[in-house]
């Protein structure tokens, strides 16, 4: 008996071939001997089966001795043994129809779980293997689960169902909803304008939700909400903003925040959360602000940084085009009685200068 695998919702063509290459009488029946379709001369006739409105054949092939049964919009319950009667012969074809669906929605938040459920006909024992867009393979039976979805899991998942050494392939498009970056750091000199950007890693037709930026300043004992906003069809509207600092927010995506001035009291870490309509859970992006200040008070030249810096970072004070006068892996350095000239305060790591502030020391007369 020939086995054919079909996909729910698809169209399948079951073949039946006569030895004579001409149009002769044929019938297709199901396992209950109920007629599905056949012919009367050059006319297609249909029986009382449940497939009535979804069954068809190809009249153009009859003259060649081919009498296919075409079933459209396949259903799991179409799984059956189909019998083609032609020239006093019976050709049996076993059709097995499978369906593969994602648990709820195909748009899932980063960190959530994806469950794929296989619908299969009674008595079948298929195995399923799915390959994610980033090449991750998962195997299972009736259900497959992937916990902790990552951004790289966005895209087309290809799943192969194996039964009776035959296979059928499903493609499911999954969109992982996340920000492009989990974390970012902005380095600014005191007084500079600060731009925070929160680009999303996905595009959807309509995007609606609400968000908030909580900020933990290094100098503060507790965190506070800096801004709350709504998102409606990709349009951003501010609901509430603190008086200090007075953040400004862009009206369009990507989410964009402007802090008019970088000040030591603002240095710290923030967490932007975005709750999307009809989704449980929130998207998160961490943002960090490091602020540098160089000052001269009487005979003391000081450079300080505030904010979440790596302990490997080096803070240096140097006179332009000269060796560093002082370098420390600390958050403040100073020089007593600095000589006149342009001094540079540098915050650097193993690969680059991250932040630089210049201060002019005038000669003392």
């Amino acid at each position: 008996k020939k086995v054919v695998l079909g996909k729910k919702g698809d169209t399948v063509e079951l073949t039946c071939t006569a030895s004579q290459k001409k149009s002769i009488q044929f019938h297709w029946k199901n396992s209950n001997q109920i007629k599905i379709l056949g012919n009367q001369g050059s006319f297609l006739t249909k029986g009382p089966s449940k497939l009535n409105d979804r069954a068809d054949s190809r009249r153009s092939l009859w003259d060649q001795g081919n009498f296919p049964l075409i079933i459209k919009n396949l259903k799991i319950e179409d799984s059956d043994t189909y019998i083609c009667e032609v020239e006093d012969q019976k050709e049996e074809v076993q059709l097995l129809v499978f369906g593969l669906t994602a648990n709820s929605d195909t748009h899932l938040l980063q960190g959530q779980s994806l469950t794929l459920t296989l619908e299969s006909p009674p008595g079948s024992s298929p195995s399923v293997q799915c390959r994610s867009p980033r090449g991750k393979n998962i195997q299972g039976g009736k259900t497959l689960s992937v916990s902790q979805l990552e951004l790289q899991d966005s895209g087309t998942w290809t799943c192969t169902v194996l039964q009776n050494q035959k296979k059928v392939e499903f493609k499911i498009d999954i969109v992982v909803l996340a920000f492009q970056k989990a974390s970012s750091i902005v380095y600014k000199k005191e007084g500079e304008q600060v731009e925070f950007s929160f680009p999303l890693a996905f595009t959807v037709e309509k995007l609606t939700g609400s968000g908030e930026l909580w900020w933990q300043a290094e100098r503060a004992s507790s965190s506070k909400s800096w801004i709350t906003f709504d998102l409606k069809n990709k349009e951003v509207s501010v609901k509430r903003v603190t008086q200090d600092p007075k953040l400004q927010m862009g009206k369009k995506l990507p989410l964009h925040l402007t802090l008019p001035q970088a000040l030591p009291q603002y240095a710290g870490s923030g967490n932007l959360t975005l709750a999307l309509e009809a989704k449980t859970g929130k998207l998160h992006q961490e943002v960090n602000l490091v602020v540098m200040r160089a000052t001269q008070l009487q005979k003391n030249l000081t450079c300080e940084v505030w904010g979440p810096t790596s302990p490997k970072l080096m803070l240096s004070l140097k006179l332009e085009n000269k060796e560093a006068k002082v370098s420390k892996r600390e958050k403040a350095v100073w020089v007593l009685n600095p000589e006149a000239g342009m001094w540079q305060c540098l915050l650097s790591d193993s690969g680059q200068v991250l932040l630089e502030s210049n201060i002019k020391v005038l000669p003392t007369w």
Epitope: A182, S183, S184, I185, Y187, N288, V290, T309, S310, P311, K312, L313, M314, S316, A324, S327, L347, S348, D349, S350, G351, Q352, L354
Partner: antibody, heavy 122, light 107 residues
């Protein structure tokens, strides 16, 4: 392509000195911190030293502090490790590696040389 | 200096198994941890940096998690080419320190 090639290894007596070199190609050498990492026969990896992109800062493992000196010549795209007062326990394969530093937040050694073998034996 | 304790020191597993290796720091290193794979006679290869970031070209069956003092490397479904020695490295502060390694062998 991006490549690091170590040289200068060999057999040396305890108390003597040796200088290892690491020739870099395929990238802007002067924009990266560089490391030396070693591995004694049959043992695990041991971090030895780092030098910053401009040579301004150098840090060492306690086991080599005061005996080894890391240096670089950015005009020659070359990293060095001067090893003085060598001991039997310095016997190892010495690897040089490039450090990527992003945003002062993400750090990793993404490119490694194949290693050069140093044997300290009398 | 920061000490890194890796466990287990050796591990036997089969192709297709899910494997977890842990690394513990003697003090808070935030997320300053990387994972490296080494095969006999070869240089180490970077797998994961800054706790959970997959290095370009590394198969997605490798993943990292943790923060503070406790970190994990997970291989979701072992492949024949994954049998090697794995090291964690704290790059949070100088001097950098490696864990003692975990040798992953075929069962």
């Amino acid at each position: 392509q991006v490549q690091l090639v170590e040289s200068g290894g060999g057999v040396v007596q305890p108390g003597r000195a040796l200088r290892l070199s690491c020739a870099a190609s395929g990238f802007t050498f002067s924009s990266y911190g560089m490391h030396w990492v070693r591995q004694a026969p049959g043992k695990g990896l041991e971090w030895v030293a780092i030098i910053w992109y401009d040579g301004s800062n150098k840090y060492y493992a306690d086991s080599v502090k005061g005996r080894f000196t890391i240096s670089r010549d950015n005009s020659k795209n070359t990293l060095y490790l001067q090893m003085n007062s060598l001991r039997a326990e310095d016997t190892a394969v010495y690897y040089c590696a490039r450090e990527v530093a992003l945003e002062g937040y993400y750090y990793y050694m993404d490119v490694w040389g194949k290693g050069t073998t140093v044997t300290v034996s009398s | 200096d920061i000490q890194m304790t890796q466990s287990p020191s050796s591990l036997s597993a089969s192709v297709g198994d899910r494997v977890t290796i842990t690394c513990r720091a003697s003090q808070d290193i935030r997320n300053g941890l990387g994972w490296y794979q080494q095969k006999p006679g070869k240089a180490p290869k970077l797998l994961i940096y800054t706790t959970s970031n997959l290095q370009s070209g590394v198969p997605s069956r490798f993943s990292g998690s943790g923060s503070g003092t406790d970190f994990t490397l997970t291989i979701s479904s072992l492949q024949p080419e994954d049998f090697a020695t794995y090291y964690c490295l704290q790059d949070y502060n100088y001097p950098y320190t490696f864990g003692q390694g975990t040798k992953l062998e075929i069962k």
